[in-house]
C-alpha cells in the first residue's frame, strides 16, 4: 500500500516532549537555563523587533531553538496544562513575526480517528439499535440520556447546567465566568463518546436542533447584549494562553484544506471536532447560530461590523467558522456515524507547525459547496415532560434539560459503525 501516504513528520528530528518536561530538562543544563532566563527577560514588556535588535536576546533564541523547549508540545487537559502553555508561548511568541492569522498549535497532534469514538459509543450505549432504523428517535435527547447513565458525565453536566442557569440578579443573567469554567471542566473531563454525541447529534427537525443549540446553555455561555467585533474578540482571546492555544488548535485541525478528500487537514475529523469542543468555555466559545436541523452553521458570538480596513481579515476569520467545509463535514459525518476511509497506511497525525504566510487557501469556487455530506440519519424530536428539575424560566431549557433525573435506558443511541472496506 502507498508508503507515501504516511503522515507527515513533526518539525525536525526530535520526538516532541511536553513543555513542562522540556523545561525541567532545560533547567538541568546551565547553558539552556541561563538562555531561557535571558529570553524571558527579553520578552517581558518589549515588542519582537526591539527584542531581536538585542544581540543577547538573539543569541538566547538561537540556542533555545536547539533545545527540547523549541519542539515541545502540550496535551489538552493535562495536569499542568496552563504551565505547559505558558512555557510554550514564552518561546513561540518570540519566534513569530507579530500577529499571525494562523498560529501553530501548542498541542500534540491527535492520532485517534472518529471510528474509535464510534466503537466506544456503541460499547457504552449497550444497545443494538441503529440510528438509521429508528426514525422516531431524537439523537440529541438520546445523547443526554446516555450521559445521565454515566456518573462522571451526569455529575459534570448537572454542575454546568445549574451554574449556567443560576440567575444572579434581574440585570445579571448568570455568572458567565463560572459557567465557562464548568463547561470547560465538562468538555475536558468527560470522554468524547458522550460530549460529541451531545454537541454533534444529527437532527431532522427544529426541536431537536434547538436542543443541540441549547447544549452549552447559550444564554449564559455564548450570547451577550451586543456582538463584539470578531478581531477584537480574537485579540482578547490571544491575551490568555489557554484561549490562544485552543484557537490555534482549532485553526490547525479545522482549517479548510484543498489537499484532502474531506477538506480537513490529514482527513482527521476527530481532530477538528476535538479542537472545536476545546474552544467551548472561553471567550471564543462557538455555537450553532440557529435551530436549523440541516443547515449547520456555527460561529463565535461576534460580527465584522466596525472592522474598518480590517473588514477582509475579519470576514476571513469568521468564515473559518461559518463557511468551513471541514467543520461542516466533520459535524455531519459524526451525526451520520461515518468516518473517512483512508488506507491502513494512511496518515495518523498532522504536523501543526505554523505556516509563515497569510493567504486564503486556494480553494476553487466549487469545492466548498460540493463537499458537504447529505445526512442519512432520520430523526424526530419528541416532547419531554418536566420531571423534577427545579423551576427555570426558559421554555427552551425545560425541553432541553429535563431528562437529567430520568434513568430510562436509551432505546436507540448506537452510532453506525463505518465500513471497513472501500465503498
Amino acid at each position: 500500500s502507498p508508503s507515501s501516504l504516511q503522515g507527515p513528520e513533526l518539525h525536525g528530528w526530535r520526538p516532541p516532549v511536553d513543555c513542562v518536561r522540556a523545561n525541567e530538562l532545560c533547567a538541568a543544563e546551565s547553558n539552556c537555563s541561563s538562555r531561557y532566563r535571558t529570553l524571558r527577560q527579553c520578552l517581558a514588556g518589549r515588542d519582537r523587533n526591539t527584542m531581536l535588535a538585542n544581540k543577547e536576546c538573539q543569541a538566547a533564541l538561537e540556542v533555545l531553538q536547539e533545545s527540547p523547549l523549541y519542539d515541545c508540545r502540550c496535551k489538552r487537559g493535562m495536569k499542568k496544562e496552563l504551565q505547559c502553555l505558558q512555557i510554550y508561548w514564552s518561546i513561540h511568541l518570540g519566534l513569530t513575526e507579530g500577529e499571525e492569522f494562523y498560529e501553530a498549535s501548542p498541542y500534540e497532534p491527535v492520532t485517534s480517528r472518529l471510528s474509535d469514538i464510534f466503537r466506544l459509543a456503541s460499547i457504552f450505549s449497550g444497545t443494538g439499535a441503529d440510528p438509521v432504523v429508528s426514525a422516531k428517535s431524537n439523537h440529541c435527547l438520546d445523547a443526554a440520556k446516555a450521559c445521565n447513565l454515566n456518573d462522571n458525565c451526569k455529575k459534570l453536566r448537572s454542575s454546568y447546567i445549574s451554574i449556567c442557569n443560576r440567575e444572579i440578579s434581574p440585570t445579571e443573567r448568570c455568572n458567565r465566568r463560572k459557567c465557562h469554567k464548568a463547561l470547560r471542566q465538562f468538555f475536558d473531563r468527560v470522554p468524547s463518546e458522550y460530549t460529541y454525541r451531545m454537541l454533534f447529534c444529527s437532527c431532522q427537525d427544529q426541536a431537536c436542533a434547538e436542543r443541540r443549540r441549547q447544549t452549552i446553555l447559550p444564554s449564559c455561555s455564548y450570547e451577550d447584549k451586543e456582538k463584539p467585533n470578531c478581531l477584537d474578540l480574537r485579540g482578547v482571546c490571544r491575551t490568555d494562553h489557554l484561549c490562544r492555544s485552543r484557537l490555534a488548535d482549532f485553526h490547525a485541525n479545522c482549517r479548510a484544506s484543498y489537499q484532502t478528500v474531506t477538506s480537513c487537514p490529514a482527513d482527521n475529523y476527530q481532530a477538528c471536532l476535538g479542537s472545536y469542543a476545546g474552544m467551548i468555555g472561553f471567550d471564543m466559545t462557538p455555537n450553532y447560530v440557529d435551530s436549523s436541523p440541516t443547515g449547520i452553521v456555527v460561529s463565535p458570538w461576534c460580527s465584522c461590523r466596525g472592522s474598518g480596513n480590517m473588514e477582509e481579515e475579519c470576514e476571513k476569520f469568521l468564515r473559518d467558522f461559518t463557511e468551513n467545509p471541514c467543520l461542516r463535514n466533520a459535524i455531519q459525518a459524526f451525526g451520520n456515524g461515518t468516518d473517512v476511509n483512508v488506507s491502513p497506511k494512511g496518515p495518523s497525525f498532522q504536523a501543526t507547525q505554523a505556516p509563515r504566510v497569510e493567504k486564503t487557501p486556494s480553494l476553487p469556487d466549487d469545492l466548498s459547496d460540493s463537499t458537504s455530506l447529505g445526512t442519512s440519519v432520520i430523526t424526530t424530536c419528541t416532547s419531554v415532560q418536566e420531571q423534577g428539575l427545579k423551576a427555570n424560566n426558559s421554555k427552551e431549557l425545560s425541553m432541553c434539560f429535563t431528562e437529567l433525573t430520568t434513568n430510562i435506558i436509551p432505546g436507540s443511541n448506537k452510532v453506525i459503525k463505518p465500513n471497513s472496506g472501500p465503498s
Epitope: S1, P2, S4, L5, Q6, G7, P8, Y102, R255, S257, Y258, Q259, T260, V261, T262, P265, A266, D267, V340, N341, V342, S343, G346, P347, A351, Q353, A354, P355, R356, V357, E358, K359, T360, P361, S362, L363, P364, D366, L367, S370, T371, S372, L373, G421, P422, S423
Partner: antibody, heavy 119, light 112 residues
Amino acid sequence: EVQLQQSGPELVKPGASVKISCKASGYSFTGYFMHWVKQRHVQSLEWIGRINPYNGATNYNQIFKDKASLTLDKSSSTAYMELHSLTSEDSAVYYCASGGHYYGNVDYWGQGTTLTVSS
Amino acid sequence: DVVMTQTPLTLSVTIGQPASISCKSSQSLLDTDGKTYLNWLLQRPGQSPKRLIYLVSKLDSGVPDRFTGSGSGTDFTLKISRVEAEDLGVYYCWQGTHFPQTFGGGTKLEIK
C-alpha cells in the same frame, strides 16, 4: 498491490465523445483523489482535473471545463473521464493518477489511454 | 495559473557524474498549512510518469537516495549525485499548492 487499470486505446471521429475508465485496486478508493492528466507529446503534461471519490466533488482546470466530465462508480472503484466534441487537438495519451496532495500529491499512475481523433 | 519553468531543457550526463535540474514557479508554493506541494516525476521512455519526490524533499519508497530534492518558496532543485543508466528519461516538477495544478515543461536527461 496498488493498481490503476485504464481502458484500451480509442480511435474516434471528430465531433464524437469518448469515455475512458480507470479501475482502482489495492487501496481505499474513497480515501484519495483521482486526477486526470493529458500528455500530447513528450515534455508536455496538463492537469485536467480531479474527482473526490469520498463525496463526488469535482474540480476542473478551467481550460478543460467544457471538454471533460469526471464521474465515478464507487461500487466498482472505477473513475471515468468523458471527453466531448473531439478534435485532433484532443489526440493524446490520458492518464488517471490517484493520491492526495496532503500525503504527497499523486502516488500511482495508470498505464495511459491513447486517444486518436481522426476522420 | 502558476507557471513552472524548468531548466535546462536537455541534460547530457556521463554515468557516475552528478546532475542538477532547476524548477522555478511564478508564485510561492508555500501553502497556508505550512507545506510546499512541489513534486518531481520521472517519465522513462514508453512508460507512465512515476513520482520520485513529494513535498519538495521527501523520497517515495523505492527511490534511491542518490536523488535529493531541495528548495523553498519559488526555487527548487532536483539533484542526482551519481547518474545511472536507469535514470534516463524526462523529469517534471509539478505544483499542487495553487489551483489549477501545473507542471514544468520537462527536462530530458540523456546519457553521454
